[in-house]
Interface confidence: medium
């Protein structure tokens, strides 16, 4: 376990022409805050992928109002470090994402408005316990200067915070909940003097006078076991001075609940009971209230009457997510009827309607036949948002204005000859065929139900039906 720490030194317009004077230009007062997100590994992950190693939000910075005549000063920044606790081993390689957000404090409908000013994403290698690393990054016209480090929290030590540090005087038995125990290091610096009576086995301290408990132990002096299991007396592999095992891997092994949450097993999974001020599947989300301004993109934060109540972000159209952080693909809701094309213009949706439809959502089916007479006795048929003329015999074209040759489509079957006639067409059939279109074979023996030849045979083939 340990903490990733980020210190923002400055954020402001980068060098060069065209850089903005300040983030508040012509917008009235504003203030900045930062969000840090840590993702494991060096892969280029999607921006939406979760901050699996953790995330943190800074406090709001002081309110800043631009003075048009004055030279642009360094922007006032939030005080303090951004700290991202990590429970497991420090991965060494990680992606660091730092977002700079602007909170506009002018008269906004629904409260302050938030917008993302800059995002820098860098893949980094960093050993825990090392010195502060300094960096300067550009994001568009902005420049961000910052330092960062990862440090282990005792009793964890080492470049990945995986070794457990034991003061020379402490016994070498591991506490419950470690499976198997990490090797204990004897070469640790002398710890500070802990609170009087703090358990040497189950407690430790970083500051003089405190008593912090190892997993599995609680109480002011870390004397009270959280669960009844311990390494002693368990069946299975024997305990040694360097390690011990607890039975089988269970969902609560290693306590997946962060921030002091307690884990209880459920069928096939686990459930964390979080202390007040934290929530989430693993108690990983710190207690945020409306005062922290958690709703982005102009979302309205509605909070309960007391701190125990949840807050909720009501997002304006176009945004969603628990903090209104995601842009909605509003066209995915298919708001345009009758095959209209949806256009999301940001401030509004627009539907481009197919011919024959109108209205904001293409909901009105126009009377396609109105004023569209079909010539030469044709009748107008509506359908699919377009009109169509069903033409009288001898005429064709979109409006039945073209004289049609009824014989052009060769309507007479089996070699019959077609003659155009004022009322349509007449077929003169070849010998052996009959019907208006010469479609029926004539059989002198009267067996008209049989085909002229078996399937696949030509009439001249020797096989015959009997």
């Amino acid at each position: 376990a340990g903490v990733f720490e980020l210190q923002i030194h400055s954020f402001g317009p980068g060098p060069g022409p065209g850089a903005p004077r300040s983030p508040c230009s012509a917008r009235g007062p504003c203030r900045l805050f930062f969000r840090v997100c840590l993702k494991p590994g060096l892969s280029e992950e999607a921006a939406e992928s979760p901050c699996a190693l953790g995330a943190a939000l800074s406090a709001r910075g002081p309110v800043y109002t631009e003075q048009p005549e004055a030279p642009a000063p360094d922007l006032p920044l939030p005080n303090g470090l951004l700290q991202v606790p990590f429970r497991d081993a420090w991965p060494g390689t990680f992606s660091l994402i730092i977002e700079t957000w602007r909170e506009e404090l002018g008269d906004q409908i629904g409260g302050p408005a938030w917008s993302l000013l800059a995002r820098v994403t860098r893949r980094r290698r960093l050993a825990a316990g090392g010195p502060w690393a300094r960096d300067i990054q550009r994001a568009g016209a902005w420049e961000l200067r910052f330092s960062y480090r990862a440090r282990c929290e005792l009793p964890a030590v080492g470049t990945a915070c995986t070794r457990l540090c034991r003061p020379r005087s402490a016994p070498s038995r591991c506490g419950p909940g470690l499976r198997p125990c990490a090797p204990l290091e004897d070469e640790c610096e002398a710890p500070p003097v802990c609170r009087a009576g703090c358990s040497l086995e189950h407690g430790f301290c970083e500051q003089p006078g405190e008593c912090r408990c190892l997993e599995g132990w609680t109480g002011p002096l870390c004397m009270v076991p959280v669960s009844t299991s311990s390494c002693l007396g368990l069946r299975g592999p024997s305990s040694t001075t360097t390690g011990c095992l607890v039975p089988g891997p269970g969902p609560c092994d290693g306590n997946p609940c962060a921030n002091g949450g307690s884990c209880s097993e459920t069928p096939g999974s686990f459930e964390c009971t979080c202390p007040r001020g934290f929530y989430g599947l693993r108690c990983e989300v710190s207690g945020v209230t409306c005062a922290d301004g958690p709703c982005f993109n102009g979302g309205l934060c509605v909070g309960g009457a007391d701190p125990d109540s949840a807050y909720i972000c009501h997002c304006p159209p176009g945004f969603q997510g628990s903090n209104c952080e995601k842009r909605v693909d509003r066209c995915s809701l298919q708001p345009c009827r009758n095959g209209g094309l949806c256009l999301d213009l940001g401030h509004a949706l627009r539907c481009r309607c197919r011919a024959g439809f109108a209205g904001p959502r293409c909901e009105h089916d126009l009377d396609d036949c109105a004023g569209r007479a079909c010539a030469n006795g044709g009748t107008c048929v509506e359908g699919g948002g377009a009109h169509r003329c069903s033409c009288a015999l001898g005429f064709g074209g979109r409006n039945c204005r073209e004289r049609a040759d009824p014989c052009a489509a060769r309507p007479c079957a089996h070699g019959g000859r077609c003659y155009a006639h004022f009322s349509g067409l007449v077929c003169a059939c070849a010998p052996g065929y009959m019907g208006a279109r010469c479609e029926f074979p004539v059989h002198p023996d009267g067996v008209s139900a049989l085909p002229a030849a078996p399937p696949g045979l030509r009439p001249g083939d020797p096989q015959r039906y009997l």
């Epitope: 979080c274 309205l300 509605v302 949840a310 009501h314 997510g321």
Partner: antibody, heavy 118, light 107 residues
Framework: QVQLQQPGAELVKPGASVKLSCKAS????????MHWVKQRPGQGLEWIGM????????NYNEKFKSKATLTVDKSSSTAYMELSSLTSEDSAVYYC???????????WGQGTSVTVSS | DIQMTQTTSSLSASLGDRVTISCSAS??????LNWYQQKPDGTVKLLIY???SLHSGVPARFSGSGSGTDYSLTISNLEPEDIAIYYC?????????FGGGTKLEIK
């Protein structure tokens, strides 16, 4: 399609408790807040509270804080509301409703009619 | 709590009519208002969210408008299936509150 199934009716005695269920299907149950709304006979709608299945967060109308307890069972995608110390004032239809991503109660259950009578 | 008032508790109109139902809030609610329809069998459906956005599947004859404290729902061409009680609901502040409802009947 999104469906919220509620039992049709419950008959309970004064002073007792009743646990109403709302089984969700057709969407990711753990991603949406679930609301509960009360409607007394011939009257309007009253918001009781809401619960988020993943976060476990709840928010109650102050008026119902000592009357209603909201819980969920994620494994069965079911939301529950327990009403305690029932009186005739609690005789009503109780609806569950999903809170859509744009802050509207976009799908409603059919409602459970609770009658408190000795 | 924010009080939502629907001054007209019942309203009678003819088929094909244009009907407007109004709703006022005891304080400004910045367009955070939804409209619901409750049919005689008790079924409740969302019609309009965020003052004027039509919920998917709702006929285009329904529309909403308003700002500040005053809002309205309009049915442009009344049809038989529109017989119902219509409720407005604010979500600007907890607790969420509904109007008393407007019962729409056919003349």
């Amino acid at each position: 399609q999104v469906q919220l199934q509620q039992p049709g009716a419950e008959l309970v005695k004064p002073g007792a408790s009743v646990k109403l269920s709302c089984k969700a299907s057709g969407y990711s149950f753990t991603s949406y807040w679930m609301h509960w709304v009360k409607q007394r006979p011939g009257q309007g709608l009253e918001w009781i509270g809401m619960i988020h299945p993943t976060l476990g967060d709840t928010n109650y109308n102050e008026k119902f804080k000592s009357k209603a307890t909201l819980t969920v069972d994620k494994s069965s995608s079911t939301a529950y509301m327990e009403l305690s110390s029932l009186t005739s004032e609690d005789s009503a239809v109780y609806y569950c409703a999903r809170l859509g991503s744009l802050s509207m109660m976009d799908y409603w259950g059919q409602g459970t009619s609770v009658t408190v009578s000795s | 709590d924010i009080q939502m008032t629907q001054t007209t508790s019942s309203l009678s109109a003819s088929l094909g009519d244009r009907v407007t139902i109004s709703c006022s809030a005891s304080q400004g609610i910045s367009n955070y208002l939804n409209w619901y329809q409750q049919k005689p069998d008790g079924t409740v459906k969302l019609l309009i969210y965020y003052t004027s956005s039509l919920h998917s599947g709702v006929p285009a004859r329904f529309s909403g408008s308003g700002s500040g404290t005053d809002y309205s729902l309009t049915i442009s061409n009344l049809e038989p299936e529109d017989i119902a009680i219509y409720y407005c609901q604010q979500y600007s502040k907890f607790p969420y509150t509904f109007g008393g409802g407007t019962k729409l009947e056919i003349k």
